[in-house]
């Protein structure tokens, strides 16, 4: 061996390629006296021979697939044929050559896949075997798709894992497969040995028939549910179905209602759990989610729409216990007296809320019944027969029936007959002079009292006076309240006075009655009065254009990016200086002159969004008055958090010594937003030096399995570096340390002699 072909008798191992005709001896054993001859025993298979003089050779080609190791014994004999040395073990290891072709276990495979299945998720495996040594390229198989039929627009809908033979959909296949267009596909799959790398590799092919089945994970049609159902609840209203059994269903109420009256069972049937009330809520939108056994969403959520159908469960209601109208003595026939507006909570513009009005009684019936009529659908009351006389009947009471298609309600109307309105209001003063006020006079302050009188019947619409400012106050800073008993008008400040925009205002009042004047009488100068309001300057703080300013930026904006701006004006026209208050994270700066806000540090959505600071606007010069507004910066998520382990894994252990390779499962997470899809991490070892001892394989988007590749680990802790990539934009990778302890176990738990070590692992694998 190693170029030496002779030597003394001792244990030896030789490696010989299979399939090669013998071309040289294996070894020449030298006899030490008294030995003179040699004898060969063991797994010779009539191939291995030793000549009496100790020449070991083989007489025909070996076949590794028949026997990969020949265990032989060689003994040295003396002249009497007695063993004087040995027997010693001689091991012949047969080295593999590529003399076997791979063969598929089936000449035809059949499978099915649902439309919209997740790309990369295997739905079928093809399997081939090769008798050659799998530890060498000779037995390393490489699968590939030779052809896909039909091939639409040259797009591959299927892919195969070259090593495992797992067939799955491509991204295009997930999006485009449609059983209505093409319900079946055929793939021709090839397998090659030599890892597919050599021109001299052997190959085999198989056919795969694939049926595309409908994806039944679809939003159901909108549901209509009649309100106030008296049927026993819960009532099934619709259903969703995941494509495979075993999904866990749940409902998500995006509206966060205090009362969410729907549920879903583990079949995917959706129920309403209690009677609905359209008048409380007329429609619901919520989501159905299907999750796997790990609680990860299997697909996007489905939107469920429930419309609550109205029934006529509400009677009309009167606007008030008694509705009071006034009618003048001389009103003409057909004049409108007023409109009775009843309400119905049922659905608008339907028969359930469509109201009819009818007068059912008039009291007194003097001088006759039927003096009034009401428009059937509008509820407007009109004078029907003749002018009324106050001295005969000063008041009428009407009972009016208001009805929808099922309910009737009685409403009561009182009609007061009042004197004709033939007198106009007359101001006691036509000019109330000048009034000087500081611009910071409080809102609600009464600044002036005005008075007009009206000779018509007291406490009726003919004598009641309403004061209006008809000139000089286009901003609506002032208002007039009337005392109904005295008709006194109180001029009050409704909005802040402003020296800068209205230093002097010439105000004109008009006094009017709510009732119309009789024909031929008109308001004249006596019903008008004026006064002059002089506003004096007060140094005021700047005023922001908004109470809250809001801006939205991506959390990864470059330092120095403009993220928003605020504006304020000083009433006196002074320049303004802007500053920030409460920038606890030191993320922002503001341009003192323009109010533009810039980032000065990296922003982080995960630290909290929106980020709230106060902006301060201060007068430059003057008395340096300032005012404060809010600035809210909404941070949009970018993929800026590398994945990490979901929990503390310090307790992982294997019982030592390992009897067979073992594995353990770990979970990853990160702090970015994943919305409905959930994270899709990929896992790999952090260093090539770990590859001889460990293997990491993905279970799903968040979980992976770490397996040992051999059993020779010492009783100690090993730290395994694992890279976790989130596949985001940009992709981020976290490198995590998974500490794994190999320890002696007692009843499946790590055994440590007292005082030996702290931090005892607690999770056995």
């Amino acid at each position: 061996q190693e170029g030496k072909f002779s030597g003394p008798l001792k244990p030896m191992t030789f490696s010989i390629y299979e399939g090669q005709e013998p071309s040289q001896i294996i070894f020449q054993f030298k006899a030490n006296p008294p030995a003179v001859t040699f004898e060969l025993t063991g797994e010779t298979d009539n191939i291995f021979v030793i000549e009496r003089e100790g020449l070991l050779y083989y007489n025909r080609a070996l076949d590794r697939e028949t026997r990969s190791t020949h265990n032989l014994q060689v003994a040295a004999l003396d002249a009497n044929g007695i063993i004087v040395e040995g027997p010693v073990p001689i091991t012949i290891k047969v080295k593999d050559i590529n003399d076997n072709r791979p063969t598929f276990l089936q000449s035809k495979y059949e499978g099915s896949v649902r439309q919209n299945s997740r790309p990369g998720k295997p739905f079928l495996y093809v399997n081939a075997t090769d008798l050659d040594d799998p530890a060498t390229p000779n037995g390393q198989l490489y699968y590939q798709i030779v052809i896909q039929l039909p091939m639409i627009n040259n797009v591959m809908y299927f892919q195969i894992n070259n090593k495992t033979g797992a067939i799955s959909l491509t991204r295009e296949g997930s999006q485009e497969l449609n059983p209505a267009k093409n319900p079946s596909y055929n793939l021709v799959i090839s397998v090659k040995d030599m890892g597919g790398q050599s021109e001299n590799s052997f190959s085999d092919t198989t056919s795969v028939d694939i049926i595309v089945t409908e994806n039944i994970w679809k939003a159901p049609k909108p549901v209509e549910m009649v309100e106030n159902s008296t049927d026993p609840h819960p009532i099934k209203i619709t259903q969703v179905r995941w494509n495979d059994p075993g999904a866990q269903y749940s409902l998500v109420d995006k509206e966060k209602l205090p009362r969410f009256p729907f549920s879903i069972d583990q079949e995917g049937d959706i129920y309403v759990t209690q009677p609905l009330d359209r008048e409380e809520k007329d429609a619901y939108v919520f989501y159905a989610v299907a999750k796997d056994e790990y609680g990860k969403p299997l697909s996007y959520p489905l939107e469920i729409h429930v419309k609550v159908k109205d029934i006529n469960d509400n009677p009309p209601t009167c606007p008030s216990p008694v509705t009071v109208f006034e009618v003048q003595e001389n009103e003409r026939l057909g004049n409108s007296i007023g409109t009775l507006t009843a309400h119905d909570r049922d659905e608008e513009n339907t028969a359930n809320s469509f109201l009819n009005y009818r007068i059912v009684e008039q009291t007194p019936k003097l001088p006759m019944d039927g003096l009034f009529l009401i428009q059937t659908y509008a509820g407007m009351l009109q004078l029907a027969k003749q002018s009324l006389k106050k001295q005969d009947t000063p008041q009428y009471n009407l009972t009016i029936e208001v009805s929808d298609k099922d309910f009737k309600t009685l409403c009561f109307v009182q009609i007061n007959v009042i004197d004709i309105n033939d007198q106009i209001p007359i101001f006691e003063k036509s000019d109330y002079g000048n009034l000087t006020l500081a611009e910071d006079t409080n809102i609600g302050s009464t600044i002036l009292t005005i008075q007009a009188t009206d000779a018509d019947e007291p406490f009726t619409g003919s004598s009641k006076i309403l004061y209006h400012i008809i000139k000089g106050d286009s901003e609506g800073r002032l208002g007039v309240d009337t005392d109904p008993h005295t008709n006194t008008g109180y001029v009050i400040i409704k909005k802040p006075l402003d020296f800068e925009t209205a230093a002097v205002s010439n105000i004109v009042f008009k006094a009017e009655n709510p009732e119309p004047l009789v024909f031929g009488v008109k308001y004249n100068a006596s019903s008008f009065a004026k006064f002059t309001l002089i506003v004096t300057d007060v140094n005021e703080a700047p005023q922001f254009s908004q109470h809250v300013f809001q801006a939205k930026v991506s959390e990864d904006v470059a330092i120095g990016t403009k993220v928003g701006n605020v504006t304020a004006k000083d009433p006196e026209g002074l320049d303004i200086s802007y500053s920030l208050r409460g920038d606890t994270r030191g993320w922002l700066k503001i341009d003192h002159v323009t109010g533009e806000i810039f980032s000065v540090a990296p922003l982080d959505r995960e630290a909290g969004s929106p980020y709230r600071v106060q902006v301060v606007a201060t007068e430059v010069g003057g008395s340096s008055l300032s005012s404060v507004s809010e600035f809210h910066l909404i941070l949009m998520d970018v993929n800026d958090n590398p994945p990490r382990l979901a929990k503390d894994y310090t307790g992982l252990f294997f019982c030592h010594p390992l009897s067979a390779p073992g594995s353990l499962i770990f979970e990853a997470t990160d702090d970015d937003q994943h919305l409905f899809r959930g994270p899709h991490f990929t896992f790999s070892l952090g260093s090539g030096s770990l590859q001889n001892d460990w293997e990491v394989s993905k279970i799903n988007g968040t979980h992976a399995r770490l397996s040992t590749r051999h059993t020779e680990f010492e009783e100690r802790e090993y730290v395994v570096l694992i890279r976790i990539n989130d596949g985001g934009r940009p992709p981020l990778e976290g490198i995590v340390s998974l500490p794994v302890t190999f320890c002696s176990c007692v009843e499946g738990s790590c055994f440590r002699p007292a005082g030996h070590q702290t931090g005892i692992p607690t999770v056995g694998m």
């Epitope: 090593k163 790999s684 030096s689 020779e712 010492e714 090993y718 990778e733």
Partner: antibody
Amino acid sequence: QVQLQQPGAELVKPGASVKLSCKASGYTFTTYWMHWVKQRPGQGLEWIGEIDPSDSYANYNQKFKGKATLTVDKSSSTAYMQLSSLTSEDSAVYYCALYYGYGDWGQGTTLTVSS
Amino acid sequence: EIVLTQSPTTMAASPGEKIIITCSVSSSISSIHLHWYQQKPGFSPKLLIYRTSNLASGVPTRFSGSGSGTSYSLTIGTMEAEDVATYYCQQGSNLPLTFGAGTRLELK
């Protein structure tokens, strides 16, 4: 069987850069990390770094950071090591090796830096 | 980084002699992370022993390895002329991977 083919020699001038190649065959290239090792004449072995061909993630010996850059071309199953700002100290034999299974090394490329 | 100190640096031996080369590790490592390579002049290093004591394919049984923690050794039971080479220990426990400075074995 696994083979790692490297050019026999490269001659470059001081201050220049060189890109050494290592063509892999006999196994699936993206499965195992590729390592690079330096051996100065008459000296021992120094580990430069490793690269995962599946995603080009690399770990470097701190001593060679800035000097060596590891890359791969998956389509041709070839690993590369670029050495920059060359000096006579960089004259050495550079090996590519598969640490998986511990035993597969290229024949080495002899780099000579000389004006 | 982990430093591997080999001794002796050079040694000469006659055929049939027993050879022991030691490798001292600066901090304790698992035995599964210590490997031995043989390099003959003009050739690439060749794996001799992996995980402290496992013989690589095709390596004669006169070679053996042992050790744990910080102390490891390579033994040649009976030296043969073809064993003339430089022997390196190497650790794979921590990055950077490191090699011993080598032991040159010559024929006496």
